[in-house]
């Protein structure tokens, strides 16, 4: 039959950051190609990445339709050069992915400090709100739009002249902190979703930004 020499995919893995979501699998194909299907628990299967020789498939367009849904994907293996024939009744070998709920499982991307502004002994630090491919009413949503107050940022800040750090939190994208006048400070932020109880509740730390460099403003 036409599928006897094909090998089922294995190690199906979801790779997702800020809702950009790719399904990866093995093995690298030898004389075979793959087609991916995705569905919600209650929905119909939708085919993507038809007869691809890749071992990944970008499923972002599907999962952003409802990031709170739970998705399942499966990868079918076909002989290389396979052409869909209406007469074929034999189901090709396939493997199911783990379930994936984007809202709960997408990794938080590394945040970026957009700006900081000093007025006297106060500094306002603003975290850049990342855009996602999630849409509502034909408008792309930011990370804050999607997560609301479920998303918090932790700010680490310290005097440029010392290593002793302080920290503050916000469930917006802005911090207003007290600083010593005449001192330069450095800042780094980390995104956290406190309600998550899984191993992806924190982002990596942002790059460090320091006063006296281009992102900042100082006003007396």
């Amino acid at each position: 039959s036409g599928t006897t020499n094909t090998v089922a995919a294995y190690n199906l893995t979801w790779k997702s950051t800020n809702f950009k979501t790719i399904l990866e699998w093995e093995p690298k194909p030898i004389n075979q190609v793959y087609t991916v299907q995705i569905s919600t628990k209650s929905g119909d299967w939708k085919s993507k990445c038809f007869y691809t020789a890749d071992t990944e498939c970008d499923l972002t367009d599907e999962i952003v339709k409802d990031v709170k849904q739970t998705y399942l994907a499966r990868v079918f293996s076909y002989p290389a050069g396979h052409v869909e024939s209406t007469g074929s009744t034999e189901e090709p070998p396939y493997e199911n992915s783990p379930e994936f709920t984007p809202y709960l499982e997408t990794n938080l991307g590394q945040p970026t400090i957009q700006s900081f502004e000093q007025v006297g002994t106060k500094v306002n630090v603003t975290v850049q709100d990342e855009w996602t491919l999630v849409r509502r009413n034909d408008t792309f949503l930011s990370l804050r739009d999607v997560f609301g107050k479920d998303l918090i940022y932790t700010l680490y800040y310290w005097k440029s002249s010392s290593s002793g750090k302080k920290t503050a939190k916000t469930n917006t994208n802005e911090f207003l902190i007290d600083v010593d006048k005449g001192e330069n400070y450095c800042f780094s932020v980390q995104a956290v979703i406190p309600s998550r109880r899984t191993a992806n509740r924190k982002s990596t730390d942002s790059p460090v930004e320091c006063m006296g460099h281009e992102k900042g403003e100082s006003r007396e």
Epitope: K165, K166, K169, T170, N171, V192, R197, A199, R201, K202
Partner: antibody, heavy 117, light 107 residues
Framework: QIQLVQSGGEVKKPGASVRVSCKAS????????VYWVRQSPGKGLEWIGY????????IYDQNFKGKATLTVDKSTSTAYMELSSLRSEDTAVYFC??????????WGQGTTVTVSS | DIQMTQSPASLSASVGDRVTITCLAS??????LAWYLQKPGKSPQLLIY???NLADGVPSRFSGSGSGTDFSFTISSLQPEDFATYYC?????????FGQGTKLEIK
């Protein structure tokens, strides 16, 4: 289930150091900060500082800088607090706790450190 | 540093009473406030987080309210096991200070 198990009580002489351990289990250790809190006899709770096992960042209360040093061993999911130059006023119960960003949801059983000549 | 002023320092009440404890922050902390209970010789136990949210497994007779600088914690009907010391804590900015505690005693 989630547990934080601390090392046993210690009696130390003034000027000595002590290391208190806090072994975490039942959760992903690097995803939660570990806080340390002191409670002197008959007194309230004092925040010492915390360590983020994910990136090693430590934050201390000014009163404990130079007194407490926080470290972690990710391979054993254990947090440590070393207290140096002990004085009688360091006699207290020391707690570790898991930080869920909005609060401290699980606490160790406490370690009594007694400083006496 | 943010100071947390908790009152009263002690409180006598009877089983079935409604009691309220307040916590005042020296500057705004939005809703970054937690409440804990501690019994003698035991570790503190989380009751309320984010000012108003009940922690897992905590009975509904406990509640929290407030935001900004003024917060309160209420037990709607005291049970015998509720006699303990209660602490508020701000988790907005370091150092993450606690209130001085309120000792709730049987009248």
């Amino acid at each position: 289930q989630i547990q934080l198990v601390q090392s046993g009580g210690e009696v130390k002489k003034p000027g000595a150091s002590v290391r208190v351990s806090c072994k975490a289990s039942g959760y992903s250790f690097t995803d939660y900060n570990v806080y340390w809190v002191r409670q002197s006899p008959g007194k309230g709770l004092e925040w010492i500082g915390y360590i983020d096992p994910y990136n090693g960042i430590t934050i201390y209360d000014q009163n404990f800088k130079g007194k407490a040093t926080l470290t972690v061993d990710k391979s054993t999911s254990t947090a440590y607090m070393e207290l140096s130059s002990l004085r009688s006023e360091d006699t207290a119960v020391y707690f570790c706790a898991r930080d869920v960003t909005t609060a401290l949801d699980f606490w160790g059983q406490g370690t009594t450190v007694t400083v006496s000549s | 540093d943010i100071q947390m002023t908790q009152s009263p320092a002690s409180l006598s009440a009877s089983v079935g009473d409604r009691v309220t404890i307040t916590c005042l922050a020296s500057q705004t902390i939005d809703t970054w406030l937690a409440w804990y209970l501690q019994k003698p010789g035991k570790s503190p136990q989380l009751l309320i987080y984010a000012a108003t949210n009940l922690a897992d497994g905590v009975p509904s007779r406990f509640s929290g309210s407030g935001s900004g600088t003024d917060f309160s914690f209420t037990i709607s009907s005291l049970q015998p096991e509720d006699f303990a010391t209660y602490y508020c804590q701000q988790v907005y900015s370091s150092p993450f200070t606690f209130g001085q505690g309120t000792k709730l005693e049987i009248k």
